[in-house]
Protein backbone atom coordinates (compact mmCIF):
# COMPACT_ATOMS: atom_id res chain seq x y z
CA UNK A 1 0.00 0.00 0.00
CA UNK A 2 2.79 2.42 0.95
CA UNK A 3 4.61 1.70 -2.33
CA UNK A 4 1.45 2.33 -4.38
CA UNK A 5 0.89 5.59 -2.49
CA UNK A 6 4.52 6.64 -2.98
CA UNK A 7 4.37 5.81 -6.68
CA UNK A 8 1.03 7.53 -7.17
CA UNK A 9 2.11 10.61 -5.26
CA UNK A 10 5.38 10.70 -7.16
CA UNK A 11 3.45 10.59 -10.42
CA UNK A 12 1.05 13.38 -9.38
CA UNK A 13 3.86 15.60 -8.03
CA UNK A 14 5.86 15.07 -11.24
CA UNK A 15 2.78 15.77 -13.36
CA UNK A 16 2.25 19.10 -11.56
CA UNK A 17 5.96 19.85 -11.87
CA UNK A 18 6.09 19.19 -15.60
CA UNK A 19 2.93 21.25 -16.15
CA UNK A 20 4.73 24.03 -14.27
CA UNK A 21 7.87 23.66 -16.40
CA UNK A 22 5.75 23.91 -19.56
CA UNK A 23 3.94 26.96 -18.14
CA UNK A 24 7.22 28.64 -17.15
CA UNK A 25 8.74 27.99 -20.58
CA UNK A 26 5.74 29.57 -22.30
CA UNK A 27 5.43 32.52 -19.91
CA UNK A 28 6.49 36.00 -21.05
CA UNK A 29 7.59 37.22 -17.64
CA UNK A 30 11.06 35.70 -17.28
CA UNK A 31 12.46 39.15 -16.69
CA UNK A 32 10.49 42.24 -15.76
CA UNK A 33 11.40 45.89 -15.69
CA UNK A 34 12.90 46.88 -12.35
CA UNK A 35 10.67 49.55 -10.83
CA UNK A 36 12.63 50.03 -7.61
CA UNK A 37 14.68 53.23 -7.39
CA UNK A 38 13.83 54.04 -11.02
CA UNK A 39 11.87 56.98 -12.45
CA UNK A 40 8.23 55.93 -12.67
CA UNK A 41 7.43 55.17 -16.28
CA UNK A 42 4.05 54.85 -17.95
CA UNK A 43 5.44 51.86 -19.83
CA UNK A 44 6.28 48.43 -18.36
CA UNK A 45 8.67 46.06 -20.14
CA UNK A 46 8.92 42.32 -19.63
CA UNK A 47 10.61 39.52 -21.54
CA UNK A 48 10.25 35.80 -22.03
CA UNK A 49 12.27 33.10 -23.78
CA UNK A 50 10.35 33.56 -27.02
CA UNK A 51 9.22 37.18 -27.11
CA UNK A 52 9.45 40.55 -25.39
CA UNK A 53 6.42 42.58 -24.37
CA UNK A 54 5.59 46.17 -23.53
CA UNK A 55 2.53 47.04 -21.48
CA UNK A 56 1.51 50.68 -21.57
CA UNK A 57 -0.40 52.28 -18.74
CA UNK A 58 -3.18 52.81 -21.28
CA UNK A 59 -3.67 49.05 -21.13
CA UNK A 60 -2.28 48.46 -24.62
CA UNK A 61 0.15 45.51 -24.68
CA UNK A 62 2.43 44.72 -27.59
CA UNK A 63 4.55 41.57 -27.82
CA UNK A 64 7.23 40.90 -30.39
CA UNK A 65 8.72 37.49 -31.06
CA UNK A 66 12.45 36.92 -31.34
CA UNK A 67 12.37 36.11 -35.04
CA UNK A 68 16.12 35.64 -35.27
CA UNK A 69 17.88 32.51 -34.15
CA UNK A 70 21.51 33.42 -34.77
CA UNK A 71 21.20 36.92 -33.34
CA UNK A 72 20.10 35.74 -29.90
CA UNK A 73 22.51 35.47 -26.95
CA UNK A 74 24.03 32.01 -26.52
CA UNK A 75 22.84 31.94 -22.90
CA UNK A 76 19.24 32.45 -23.97
CA UNK A 77 19.58 29.63 -26.49
CA UNK A 78 21.05 27.43 -23.76
CA UNK A 79 18.15 28.21 -21.42
CA UNK A 80 15.65 27.41 -24.18
CA UNK A 81 17.43 24.12 -24.83
CA UNK A 82 17.50 23.15 -21.16
CA UNK A 83 13.79 23.89 -20.75
CA UNK A 84 12.83 21.98 -23.88
CA UNK A 85 14.97 19.00 -22.87
CA UNK A 86 13.31 19.14 -19.44
CA UNK A 87 9.84 19.14 -21.01
CA UNK A 88 10.64 16.31 -23.44
CA UNK A 89 12.20 14.12 -20.74
CA UNK A 90 9.34 14.91 -18.39
CA UNK A 91 6.73 14.06 -21.01
CA UNK A 92 8.42 10.73 -21.81
CA UNK A 93 8.76 10.09 -18.09
CA UNK A 94 5.04 10.69 -17.61
CA UNK A 95 4.20 8.31 -20.44
CA UNK A 96 6.43 5.59 -19.00
CA UNK A 97 5.19 6.13 -15.45
CA UNK A 98 1.54 5.75 -16.48
CA UNK A 99 2.25 2.17 -17.56
CA UNK A 100 4.41 1.62 -14.49
CA UNK A 101 1.65 2.56 -12.04
CA UNK A 102 0.79 -0.34 -9.73
CA UNK A 103 -2.92 0.43 -9.88
CA UNK A 104 -2.97 0.01 -13.67
CA UNK A 105 -2.68 -3.46 -15.20
CA UNK A 106 -1.45 -4.03 -18.72
CA UNK A 107 -1.79 -7.69 -19.68
CA UNK A 108 0.41 -9.86 -17.55
CA UNK A 109 3.16 -7.31 -16.86
CA UNK A 110 5.65 -8.51 -14.28
CA UNK A 111 6.31 -6.47 -11.14
CA UNK A 112 9.97 -6.42 -12.13
CA UNK A 113 9.02 -4.75 -15.44
CA UNK A 114 6.90 -2.19 -13.57
CA UNK A 115 9.78 -1.61 -11.18
CA UNK A 116 12.16 -0.97 -14.06
CA UNK A 117 9.69 1.40 -15.70
CA UNK A 118 9.13 3.20 -12.40
CA UNK A 119 12.90 3.63 -12.00
CA UNK A 120 13.26 4.82 -15.60
CA UNK A 121 10.50 7.40 -15.20
CA UNK A 122 11.92 8.45 -11.84
CA UNK A 123 15.35 9.10 -13.35
CA UNK A 124 13.71 10.98 -16.23
CA UNK A 125 11.80 13.18 -13.79
CA UNK A 126 14.97 13.88 -11.81
CA UNK A 127 16.89 14.87 -14.95
CA UNK A 128 13.87 16.89 -16.18
CA UNK A 129 13.68 18.76 -12.87
CA UNK A 130 17.42 19.40 -12.89
CA UNK A 131 17.23 20.73 -16.47
CA UNK A 132 14.46 23.17 -15.48
CA UNK A 133 16.28 24.30 -12.33
CA UNK A 134 19.51 24.70 -14.31
CA UNK A 135 17.76 26.65 -17.09
CA UNK A 136 16.04 29.02 -14.70
CA UNK A 137 19.22 29.47 -12.66
CA UNK A 138 21.31 30.27 -15.75
CA UNK A 139 18.74 32.90 -16.78
CA UNK A 140 18.66 34.32 -13.24
CA UNK A 141 22.44 34.56 -13.20
CA UNK A 142 22.33 36.34 -16.57
CA UNK A 143 19.83 38.83 -15.13
CA UNK A 144 21.89 39.52 -12.02
CA UNK A 145 25.01 40.13 -14.14
CA UNK A 146 23.16 42.47 -16.51
CA UNK A 147 21.43 44.23 -13.61
CA UNK A 148 24.69 45.24 -11.94
CA UNK A 149 26.27 46.14 -15.25
CA UNK A 150 23.38 48.46 -16.12
CA UNK A 151 23.41 49.90 -12.59
CA UNK A 152 27.10 50.75 -13.02
CA UNK A 153 26.34 52.30 -16.43
CA UNK A 154 23.57 54.46 -14.96
CA UNK A 155 26.07 56.41 -12.88
CA UNK A 156 28.70 56.89 -15.57
CA UNK A 157 28.77 59.27 -18.49
CA UNK A 158 29.22 62.98 -19.14
CA UNK A 159 29.93 64.62 -15.79
CA UNK A 160 27.93 61.95 -14.03
CA UNK A 161 24.76 63.23 -15.71
CA UNK A 162 22.31 60.52 -16.62
CA UNK A 163 21.60 61.06 -20.31
CA UNK A 164 19.19 58.20 -20.83
CA UNK A 165 17.40 56.01 -18.37
CA UNK A 166 18.59 52.46 -18.86
CA UNK A 167 15.87 49.85 -18.42
CA UNK A 168 17.01 47.36 -15.79
CA UNK A 169 15.43 43.95 -15.55
CA UNK A 170 14.79 41.84 -12.50
CA UNK A 171 13.38 38.36 -11.81
CA UNK A 172 10.01 37.69 -13.40
CA UNK A 173 7.26 35.37 -12.21
CA UNK A 174 8.34 32.64 -14.65
CA UNK A 175 11.62 32.16 -12.77
CA UNK A 176 9.82 31.34 -9.54
CA UNK A 177 7.35 29.10 -11.37
CA UNK A 178 10.31 27.33 -13.00
CA UNK A 179 12.21 26.84 -9.76
CA UNK A 180 9.16 25.46 -7.94
CA UNK A 181 8.14 23.29 -10.90
CA UNK A 182 11.66 21.94 -11.31
CA UNK A 183 11.79 21.16 -7.61
CA UNK A 184 8.45 19.36 -7.72
CA UNK A 185 9.53 17.29 -10.74
CA UNK A 186 12.74 16.40 -8.92
CA UNK A 187 10.86 15.38 -5.76
CA UNK A 188 8.40 13.37 -7.86
CA UNK A 189 11.30 11.59 -9.53
CA UNK A 190 12.90 10.74 -6.19
CA UNK A 191 9.55 9.38 -4.97
CA UNK A 192 9.29 7.20 -8.08
CA UNK A 193 12.79 5.84 -7.46
CA UNK A 194 11.87 5.09 -3.83
CA UNK A 195 8.67 3.36 -5.00
CA UNK A 196 10.75 1.30 -7.43
CA UNK A 197 12.70 -0.20 -4.55
CA UNK A 198 9.45 -1.38 -3.01
CA UNK A 199 8.21 -2.81 -6.30
CA UNK A 200 11.36 -4.65 -7.30
CA UNK A 201 11.59 -8.10 -5.67
CA UNK A 202 15.09 -8.68 -4.29
CA UNK A 203 17.02 -11.94 -4.86
CA UNK A 204 17.74 -14.06 -1.77
CA UNK A 205 19.28 -17.48 -1.22
CA UNK A 206 15.93 -18.92 -0.21
CA UNK A 207 13.23 -19.99 -2.57
CA UNK A 208 9.65 -20.54 -1.64
CA UNK A 209 8.60 -24.18 -1.67
CA UNK A 210 5.07 -24.81 -2.83
CA UNK A 211 3.12 -27.68 -1.37
CA UNK A 212 0.13 -28.40 -3.54
CA UNK A 213 -2.99 -29.28 -1.70
CA UNK A 214 -6.24 -30.08 -3.44
CA UNK A 215 -8.42 -27.05 -4.03
CA UNK A 216 -5.85 -24.36 -3.51
CA UNK A 217 -2.16 -23.82 -3.14
CA UNK A 218 -0.41 -22.48 -0.08
CA UNK A 219 3.12 -21.25 -0.29
CA UNK A 220 5.01 -21.88 2.92
CA UNK A 221 7.81 -19.44 3.32
CA UNK A 222 10.96 -20.01 5.37
CA UNK A 223 10.78 -17.49 8.18
CA UNK A 224 7.11 -18.29 8.52
CA UNK A 225 5.80 -14.72 8.76
CA UNK A 226 3.14 -14.81 6.12
CA UNK A 227 1.41 -17.27 3.87
CA UNK A 228 -0.19 -16.14 0.67
CA UNK A 229 -3.15 -17.81 -0.91
CA UNK A 230 -3.95 -17.72 -4.55
CA UNK A 231 -6.73 -18.80 -6.84
CA UNK A 232 -6.01 -21.87 -8.97
CA UNK A 233 -2.62 -23.50 -9.15
CA UNK A 234 0.42 -21.31 -8.69
CA UNK A 235 3.63 -23.15 -9.29
CA UNK A 236 5.81 -20.06 -9.55
CA UNK A 237 8.47 -19.76 -6.94
CA UNK A 238 8.24 -16.40 -5.27
CA UNK A 239 11.26 -14.39 -4.23
CA UNK A 240 11.37 -13.64 -0.55
CA UNK A 241 12.52 -10.56 1.31
CA UNK A 242 14.69 -11.07 4.36
CA UNK A 243 12.18 -11.60 7.15
CA UNK A 244 10.12 -8.85 8.74
CA UNK A 245 6.52 -7.87 8.28
CA UNK A 246 5.55 -6.86 4.78
CA UNK A 247 2.94 -4.65 3.26
CA UNK A 248 0.48 -5.90 0.68
CA UNK A 249 2.55 -4.20 -2.03
CA UNK A 250 5.49 -6.46 -1.36
CA UNK A 251 3.50 -9.62 -1.93
CA UNK A 252 2.59 -10.58 -5.47
CA UNK A 253 -1.03 -9.71 -5.94
CA UNK A 254 -3.56 -11.66 -7.97
CA UNK A 255 -6.26 -10.35 -10.24
CA UNK A 256 -9.52 -9.53 -8.57
CA UNK A 257 -12.73 -7.85 -9.66
CA UNK A 258 -11.27 -4.54 -8.46
CA UNK A 259 -8.28 -4.65 -10.80
CA UNK A 260 -8.15 -2.54 -13.95
CA UNK A 261 -6.95 -4.16 -17.13
Amino acid sequence: MAVTACQGLGFVVSLIGIAGIIAATCMDQWSTQDLYNNPVTAVFNYQGLWRSCVRESSGFTECRGYFTLLGLPAMLQAVRALMIVGIVLGAIGLLVSIFALKCIRIGSMEDSAKANMTLTSGIMFIVSGLCAIAGVSVFANMLVTNFWMSTANMYTGMGGMVQTVQTRYTFGAALFVGWVAGGLTLIGGVMMCIACRGLAPEETNYKAVSYHASGHSVAYKPGGFKASTGFGSNTKNKKIYDGGARTEDEVQSYPSKHDYV
Partner: antibody, heavy 118, light 113 residues
Framework: QVQLQQSGREVVRPGTSVKVSCKPS????????IDWVKQRPGQGLEWIGG????????VYNEKFKAKATLTADKSSMTANMQLSSLTSDDSAVYFC???????????WGQGTLVTVSA | DIVMSQSPSSLTVTAGEKVTMSCKSS????????????LTWYQQKPGQPPKLLIY???TRESGVPDRFTGSGSGKDFTLTISSVQAEDLALYYC?????????FGAGTKLELK
Amino acid sequence: QVQLQQSGREVVRPGTSVKVSCKPSGYAFTNYLIDWVKQRPGQGLEWIGGINPGSGDTVYNEKFKAKATLTADKSSMTANMQLSSLTSDDSAVYFCARRVRGNSFDSWGQGTLVTVSA
Amino acid sequence: DIVMSQSPSSLTVTAGEKVTMSCKSSQSLLNSGNQKNYLTWYQQKPGQPPKLLIYWASTRESGVPDRFTGSGSGKDFTLTISSVQAEDLALYYCQNNYFYPLTFGAGTKLELK
Protein backbone atom coordinates in the same frame (compact mmCIF):
# COMPACT_ATOMS: atom_id res chain seq x y z
CA GLN B 1 -18.51 57.60 -31.96
CA VAL B 2 -16.46 58.23 -28.83
CA GLN B 3 -17.55 61.25 -26.83
CA LEU B 4 -16.71 62.62 -23.37
CA GLN B 5 -19.37 64.88 -21.93
CA GLN B 6 -18.28 67.14 -19.07
CA SER B 7 -20.35 68.98 -16.49
CA GLY B 8 -21.07 72.70 -16.89
CA ARG B 9 -19.06 75.70 -15.74
CA GLU B 10 -18.68 76.36 -12.02
CA VAL B 11 -18.22 79.56 -10.07
CA VAL B 12 -17.09 78.83 -6.53
CA ARG B 13 -15.81 80.61 -3.42
CA PRO B 14 -12.19 80.32 -2.30
CA GLY B 15 -11.61 77.56 0.27
CA THR B 16 -14.52 75.47 -0.95
CA SER B 17 -14.60 72.34 -3.10
CA VAL B 18 -15.94 71.52 -6.53
CA LYS B 19 -16.71 68.29 -8.35
CA VAL B 20 -16.23 68.08 -12.10
CA SER B 21 -17.73 65.07 -13.86
CA CYS B 22 -17.01 63.39 -17.17
CA LYS B 23 -19.39 60.93 -18.83
CA PRO B 24 -17.86 58.98 -21.72
CA SER B 25 -19.96 57.24 -24.37
CA GLY B 26 -19.34 55.20 -27.48
CA TYR B 27 -16.98 52.67 -25.86
CA ALA B 28 -16.68 50.33 -22.86
CA PHE B 29 -16.16 52.66 -19.89
CA THR B 30 -13.94 50.27 -17.91
CA ASN B 31 -11.60 49.51 -20.83
CA TYR B 32 -9.73 52.82 -20.94
CA LEU B 33 -8.04 55.11 -18.44
CA ILE B 34 -9.48 58.58 -17.97
CA ASP B 35 -6.99 61.43 -17.50
CA TRP B 36 -7.55 64.96 -16.30
CA VAL B 37 -5.74 68.01 -17.69
CA LYS B 38 -5.70 71.60 -16.44
CA GLN B 39 -5.39 74.65 -18.69
CA ARG B 40 -5.25 78.11 -17.19
CA PRO B 41 -6.46 80.97 -19.42
CA GLY B 42 -3.84 81.69 -22.08
CA GLN B 43 -1.52 79.06 -20.59
CA GLY B 44 -0.30 75.58 -21.49
CA LEU B 45 -1.55 72.15 -20.48
CA GLU B 46 -0.85 70.45 -17.14
CA TRP B 47 -1.54 66.79 -16.46
CA ILE B 48 -3.35 66.28 -13.13
CA GLY B 49 -3.66 62.50 -13.02
CA GLY B 50 -5.45 59.46 -14.34
CA ILE B 51 -7.84 56.77 -13.16
CA ASN B 52 -8.55 53.23 -14.28
CA PRO B 53 -12.37 53.07 -14.12
CA GLY B 54 -12.29 49.27 -14.02
CA SER B 55 -10.07 48.89 -10.96
CA GLY B 56 -10.28 52.34 -9.41
CA ASP B 57 -6.47 52.61 -9.47
CA THR B 58 -5.21 56.16 -9.71
CA VAL B 59 -1.96 57.89 -10.60
CA TYR B 60 -1.39 61.55 -9.74
CA ASN B 61 0.95 64.34 -10.65
CA GLU B 62 2.64 65.01 -7.27
CA LYS B 63 1.79 68.71 -7.71
CA PHE B 64 -1.95 67.94 -7.61
CA LYS B 65 -2.00 65.12 -5.07
CA ALA B 66 -3.33 67.30 -2.27
CA LYS B 67 -5.64 69.22 -4.57
CA ALA B 68 -7.43 66.65 -6.74
CA THR B 69 -9.22 63.38 -5.96
CA LEU B 70 -10.13 61.17 -8.88
CA THR B 71 -12.98 58.68 -8.69
CA ALA B 72 -15.00 56.57 -11.12
CA ASP B 73 -18.54 55.31 -10.73
CA LYS B 74 -19.12 52.18 -12.79
CA SER B 75 -22.88 52.18 -12.26
CA SER B 76 -23.37 55.65 -13.75
CA MET B 77 -20.29 55.24 -16.01
CA THR B 78 -18.93 58.58 -14.89
CA ALA B 79 -15.45 59.76 -13.97
CA ASN B 80 -15.22 62.51 -11.37
CA MET B 81 -12.58 64.92 -10.16
CA GLN B 82 -12.98 66.66 -6.81
CA LEU B 83 -10.93 69.81 -6.31
CA SER B 84 -10.53 70.96 -2.71
CA SER B 85 -9.35 74.09 -0.85
CA LEU B 86 -9.80 76.19 -3.95
CA THR B 87 -7.78 79.34 -4.59
CA SER B 88 -7.60 81.74 -7.53
CA ASP B 89 -4.76 79.57 -8.95
CA ASP B 90 -7.32 76.83 -9.47
CA SER B 91 -9.33 78.97 -11.87
CA ALA B 92 -8.91 77.12 -15.15
CA VAL B 93 -10.50 74.92 -17.78
CA TYR B 94 -10.37 71.25 -16.78
CA PHE B 95 -10.44 68.59 -19.47
CA CYS B 96 -11.01 64.88 -19.18
CA ALA B 97 -9.47 62.67 -21.85
CA ARG B 98 -9.33 59.01 -22.80
CA ARG B 99 -5.89 57.40 -22.71
CA VAL B 100 -5.11 55.09 -25.64
CA ARG B 101 -2.08 53.43 -27.27
CA GLY B 102 1.14 55.35 -26.94
CA ASN B 103 -0.36 56.64 -23.67
CA SER B 104 -1.76 59.46 -25.78
CA PHE B 105 -5.16 61.12 -25.34
CA ASP B 106 -7.35 60.55 -28.40
CA SER B 107 -10.70 61.86 -27.21
CA TRP B 108 -11.24 64.89 -25.01
CA GLY B 109 -14.18 66.39 -23.17
CA GLN B 110 -15.28 69.87 -24.14
CA GLY B 111 -13.76 71.26 -20.94
CA THR B 112 -15.25 72.61 -17.71
CA LEU B 113 -14.42 76.15 -16.72
CA VAL B 114 -13.98 76.54 -12.96
CA THR B 115 -13.84 80.10 -11.69
CA VAL B 116 -12.75 80.73 -8.10
CA SER B 117 -14.04 84.10 -7.07
CA ALA B 118 -14.89 85.81 -3.82
CA ASP C 1 9.84 65.99 -13.76
CA ILE C 2 10.62 65.75 -17.47
CA VAL C 3 10.93 69.18 -19.08
CA MET C 4 9.57 69.52 -22.61
CA SER C 5 11.02 72.50 -24.49
CA GLN C 6 9.26 73.66 -27.65
CA SER C 7 10.67 76.03 -30.20
CA PRO C 8 9.90 78.44 -31.64
CA SER C 9 7.16 79.75 -29.36
CA SER C 10 5.41 81.21 -32.42
CA LEU C 11 5.68 80.86 -36.17
CA THR C 12 4.29 83.21 -38.83
CA VAL C 13 3.72 81.44 -42.11
CA THR C 14 2.03 81.75 -45.47
CA ALA C 15 -0.40 79.19 -46.89
CA GLY C 16 1.32 76.38 -48.81
CA GLU C 17 4.57 76.84 -46.94
CA LYS C 18 6.47 73.97 -45.29
CA VAL C 19 6.74 74.32 -41.52
CA THR C 20 8.83 72.52 -38.91
CA MET C 21 8.63 72.90 -35.15
CA SER C 22 10.88 71.35 -32.55
CA CYS C 23 10.35 69.64 -29.21
CA LYS C 24 13.21 68.64 -26.91
CA SER C 25 12.92 66.42 -23.86
CA SER C 26 15.17 66.54 -20.79
CA GLN C 27 15.34 62.72 -20.87
CA SER C 28 15.18 60.15 -23.64
CA LEU C 29 11.62 59.06 -24.39
CA LEU C 30 12.78 55.96 -26.27
CA ASN C 31 11.62 52.72 -24.72
CA SER C 32 14.17 49.96 -25.29
CA GLY C 33 11.51 47.24 -25.02
CA ASN C 34 9.76 48.12 -28.29
CA GLN C 35 12.04 50.81 -29.71
CA LYS C 36 9.18 53.30 -29.64
CA ASN C 37 9.43 56.95 -28.64
CA TYR C 38 6.70 57.96 -26.23
CA LEU C 39 6.06 61.43 -27.58
CA THR C 40 2.72 62.81 -28.74
CA TRP C 41 1.78 65.90 -30.75
CA TYR C 42 -1.55 67.73 -30.26
CA GLN C 43 -3.22 70.58 -32.10
CA GLN C 44 -5.42 73.02 -30.17
CA LYS C 45 -7.61 75.70 -31.67
CA PRO C 46 -9.06 78.53 -29.56
CA GLY C 47 -12.02 77.49 -27.42
CA GLN C 48 -11.55 73.80 -28.29
CA PRO C 49 -9.94 70.84 -26.55
CA PRO C 50 -6.62 69.56 -27.94
CA LYS C 51 -6.75 67.14 -30.87
CA LEU C 52 -4.41 64.16 -31.18
CA LEU C 53 -2.21 64.34 -34.29
CA ILE C 54 0.77 62.04 -33.80
CA TYR C 55 1.65 59.39 -31.20
CA TRP C 56 4.77 57.24 -30.77
CA ALA C 57 6.61 60.27 -32.22
CA SER C 58 5.79 59.33 -35.82
CA THR C 59 2.49 57.40 -35.99
CA ARG C 60 -0.28 59.52 -37.47
CA GLU C 61 -3.68 59.26 -35.80
CA SER C 62 -6.45 58.08 -38.12
CA GLY C 63 -8.20 60.97 -39.86
CA VAL C 64 -5.18 63.27 -39.58
CA PRO C 65 -4.08 64.65 -42.99
CA ASP C 66 -0.82 63.21 -44.30
CA ARG C 67 0.73 66.65 -44.52
CA PHE C 68 1.44 66.24 -40.80
CA THR C 69 4.59 64.22 -40.14
CA GLY C 70 6.31 63.45 -36.87
CA SER C 71 9.96 62.49 -36.63
CA GLY C 72 12.87 62.23 -34.22
CA SER C 73 14.07 59.87 -31.53
CA GLY C 74 15.40 59.93 -27.98
CA LYS C 75 15.28 63.56 -26.92
CA ASP C 76 14.84 65.54 -30.15
CA PHE C 77 11.57 65.54 -32.04
CA THR C 78 10.08 67.47 -34.95
CA LEU C 79 6.59 68.09 -36.27
CA THR C 80 6.49 68.97 -39.96
CA ILE C 81 3.54 70.38 -41.90
CA SER C 82 4.43 69.93 -45.58
CA SER C 83 1.99 72.51 -46.93
CA VAL C 84 0.25 74.71 -44.36
CA GLN C 85 -3.49 75.25 -44.81
CA ALA C 86 -5.57 78.00 -43.21
CA GLU C 87 -7.23 75.44 -40.89
CA ASP C 88 -3.80 74.47 -39.49
CA LEU C 89 -3.42 77.75 -37.68
CA ALA C 90 -3.45 76.73 -34.03
CA LEU C 91 -1.33 75.92 -31.00
CA TYR C 92 0.79 72.76 -31.19
CA TYR C 93 1.81 70.90 -28.05
CA CYS C 94 4.19 68.00 -27.60
CA GLN C 95 3.73 65.63 -24.65
CA ASN C 96 5.96 63.20 -22.79
CA ASN C 97 4.05 59.94 -22.50
CA TYR C 98 6.88 57.90 -21.02
CA PHE C 99 7.64 59.25 -17.56
CA TYR C 100 5.21 60.22 -14.82
CA PRO C 101 4.08 62.90 -14.45
CA LEU C 102 3.07 63.15 -18.09
CA THR C 103 4.27 66.60 -19.12
CA PHE C 104 3.46 68.98 -21.98
CA GLY C 105 5.59 71.51 -23.78
CA ALA C 106 4.66 75.21 -23.62
CA GLY C 107 3.41 75.06 -27.20
CA THR C 108 4.20 76.53 -30.61
CA LYS C 109 1.70 79.02 -32.01
CA LEU C 110 1.20 78.89 -35.76
CA GLU C 111 -0.01 82.22 -37.19
CA LEU C 112 -0.81 83.44 -40.66
CA LYS C 113 1.33 86.18 -42.22
